[in-house]
């Protein structure tokens, strides 16, 4: 059997096989050693007994999408049945004091591979034997501690495969320079050691995407905006736009990146090399935000122009290869190609509460001689739209430990002047966070307030 017979049906074209060689990967036309690595079809009854105590689940993730030319990393994590884990020696053991369907196990090991490898014979002095090989016959690499690696992972994509010895979690990075753009399929088959052979325990597949567009995302933040994810923002307050470029392999680290903004409000184009920008909308309405990101990235070199055809035959100037035209195209040349990314959003601008201020704090006189609590009036002004709700969060003087939160609807006229009355139990210093809110905005102000003792020697006073 060949690798492509074993590893899935997604067979790319011959063109792909010839032109998209991944560095360090091998063609899936190679032979697969079925004696050492048995192949079971989906639904084969043997899968049921491939692992003691249940089925192992493999989870495959990637940091896709990847800009063509960058590295994409795939990670496989094995999830063992309940109460099982991998120990420091790579053996699979039962977790202490963990009870599964079978109850507590007397044997601490699910798989004691250390014991197996110590018992195994037929090895030469290098620790190499005929069974310490991958499905294509290549020997296992002898990294320090390789004996504690008891899982064999076979990655398969684009008609090629990559084999890796590992523990319960492995990562593989692939350079995408030769990968066809668009969605591609990665399939992984996982085997475990079983004496002098291997047993399949899991198969998993995932789609990844290679693109020639820079993957771009923009986060938007505005002070007083109640919900930053609804793309509704407030008039007359700056919005901070922060561009996040998805570049996990740092492919664009040395590129100059330009950001070209159009805010859709007839303020023209704004070009910047900074990933953050502030913009204030001064009108209500719906606006179309457009961003174009441009980066000069490493890329393929264009084919050389054909040499000019001489009108007369000229005598050769020297041996072939000494031609200065040929010298200009060295195999490792670093060419740059402009890559672009785009982001578009529709932003709604509405009225909101722009500012809130406490202009006065007054101790309210109580009818009782020495009441247990104090009433404080906060006279509050605001700018912008009419608030509908007031919240006060009363906390300790550091403003960290909340003692009391009270929210209530508020009736405010268009002058936006209101008085908020709150109860303080006992004297001392309090931090008061006061927020005024409406449907779209939430404006905050804070103050420290000193509530006096309630005894005859401590007169009622205004705290400022």
């Amino acid at each position: 059997k060949r690798f492509h017979d074993v590893l899935g049906n997604e067979r790319p074209s011959a063109y792909m096989r010839e032109h998209n060689q991944l560095n360090g990967w091998s063609s899936d036309e190679n032979d697969w050693n079925e004696k050492l690595y048995p192949v079971w079809k989906r639904g084969d009854m043997r899968w049921k007994n491939s692992w003691k105590g249940g089925r192992v689940q493999a989870v495959l993730t990637s940091d896709s999408p990847a800009l063509v030319g960058s590295n994409i990393t795939f990670a496989v994590n094995l999830i063992f049945p309940r109460c099982q884990k991998e120990d420091a020696n790579g053996n699979i053991v039962y977790e202490k004091n963990c009870r599964n369907e079978a109850g507590l196990s007397a044997d601490p090991y699910v798989y004691n591979w250390t014991a197996w490898s110590e018992d195994s014979d037929g090895e030469n002095g290098t620790g190499q034997s005929h069974h310490n090989v991958f499905p294509d016959g290549k020997p296992f690499p002898h990294h320090p501690g390789w004996r504690r690696w008891n899982f064999i992972y076979v990655f398969h994509t684009l008609g090629q495969y990559f084999q890796k010895l590992g523990r319960c979690s492995v990562r593989v990075s692939v350079n995408t320079a030769n990968v066809t753009l668009g969605p591609q399929l990665m399939e992984v088959t996982v085997y475990r050691r079983h004496g002098r052979a291997y047993v399949p325990i899991a198969q998993v597949k995932d789609v990844y995407v290679v693109t020639d567009q820079i993957p771009v995302f923009v986060t938007m933040f505005q002070k007083n905006d109640r919900n930053s994810s609804d793309e509704t923002f407030l008039k007359d307050l700056p919005i901070m736009f922060d561009v996040l470029i998805h570049d996990p392999s740092h492919f664009l680290n040395y590129s100059t990146i330009n950001y070209k903004w159009s805010f859709g409000d007839n303020t023209g184009l704004f070009v910047s090399t900074n990933h953050t920008v502030n913009h204030t909308y001064v009108l209500n309405g719906t606006f179309s935000l457009n961003l174009t990101v441009k980066a000069a990235a490493p890329g393929p070199c264009p084919p050389p122009p054909p040499p000019p055809r001489p009108s007369k035959p000229t005598p050769s100037l020297g041996p072939a290869g000494d031609n200065p035209l040929e010298l200009s195209r060295i195999p490792d040349e670093n060419c740059q190609i402009n890559r672009y990314g785009h982001f578009q959003a529709t932003i709604t601008i509405v009225e909101g509460i722009l500012e809130v201020n406490i202009i006065q704090m007054t101790d309210v006189l109580m009818p009782v001689p020495w009441p247990e609590s104090s009433l404080i009036d906060f006279v509050v002004t605001c700018q912008g739209s009419i608030p509908t709700e007031v919240c006060t969060i009363i906390s300790d003087p550091t403003c960290e430990i909340t003692q009391n939160t009270v929210c209530s609807p508020v009736d405010v006229d268009e002058m936006c002047l209101l008085t908020v009355r709150r109860t303080f139990n006992g004297s001392g210093t309090y931090c008061v966070n006061l927020t005024l809110g409406d449907d779209t905005s939430l404006a905050l102000t804070s103050t420290l307030i000193s509530v006096p003792d309630r005894d005859p020697a401590s007169p009622l006073r205004m705290a400022n």
Epitope: I386, T388, T392, V406, S408, P409, D411, T423
Partner: antibody
Framework: EVQLLESGGGLVQPGGSLRLSCAAS????????MSWVRQAPGKGLEWVSS????????YYADSVKGRFTISRDNSKNTLYLQMNSLRAEDTAVYYC?????????WGQGTLVTVSS | QSVLTQPPSASGTPGQRVTISCSGS????????VSWYQQLPGTAPKLLIY???QRPSGVPDRFSGSKSGTSASLAISGLRSEDEADYYC???????????FGGGTKLTVLG
């Protein structure tokens, strides 16, 4: 002079629906929260629902949540209460009131009778 | 069962001073303004006191409101026969997210 005039009350069978209206005048309607308060025959006042000036925030009493819907049309200076799945215990005079942290002006009320 | 507790009835003779109490909790009276409403027989309620102790224009200064902790009270001095009515206290309740009323106090002017 502030005026609130309720309409739309009447006799309805249990499970039925009714829509009350409150026409407001004498103040800037679009700038004020509005509320509905009801009073069952011979009983005390019970708050029903409130709505913010723009209509974006709405509050309901637990007894009507999911059955009643408060709304407003600021261009028509009108407050509404859509009452569905009416029950005998919803029988009351329904008052429209201005504001929501205190009710400074009240309409004369409209009687809703739920009976088979 | 009302969230705010009022005595069901109160009475006094003309010229007397009468006080109606209203007790609640920190989530309503304790941290929100109390209002008082007067409902004359067969009419709609009318705002008498707002923000614990403020009188709207047109309300005689015989009516006064006060609050201490989680209790509020309405005082009517120089009682008159036209004060015979039902009186309700009310406040927003921040825990229930609802406006709550007292059960009402029926004030009778004797003589």
């Amino acid at each position: 002079e502030v005026q609130l005039l309720e309409s739309g009350g009447g006799l309805v069978q249990p499970g039925g629906s009714l829509r009350l209206s409150c026409a407001a005048s004498g103040f800037t309607f679009r700038a004020r929260p509005m509320s509905w308060v009801r009073q069952a025959p011979g009983k005390g006042l019970e708050w029903v629902s409130s709505i913010s000036h723009s209509g974006g925030s709405k509050y309901y009493a637990d007894s009507v949540k999911g059955r009643f819907t408060i709304s407003r049309d600021n261009s028509k200076n009108t407050l509404y209460l859509q009452m569905n799945s009416l029950r005998a215990e919803d029988t009351a005079v329904y008052y429209c009131a201005r504001k929501w942290s205190t009710f400074d002006y009240w309409g004369q009320g409209t009687l809703v009778t739920v009976s088979s | 069962q009302s969230v705010l507790t009022q005595p069901p009835s109160a009475s006094g003779t003309p010229g007397q001073r009468v006080t109606i109490s209203c007790s609640g909790s920190s989530s309503n009276i304790g941290n929100n303004y109390v209002s008082w409403y007067q409902q004359l027989p067969g009419t709609a309620p009318k705002l008498l006191i707002y923000a614990d102790s403020q009188r709207p224009s047109g309300v005689p200064d015989r009516f006064s409101g006060s609050k201490s902790g989680t209790s509020a009270s309405l005082a009517i001095s120089g009682l008159r026969s036209e004060d015979e009515a039902d009186y309700y206290c009310g406040a927003w309740d921040s825990s229930l997210n609802a406006y709550v009323f007292g059960g009402g106090t029926k004030l009778t002017v004797l003589g």
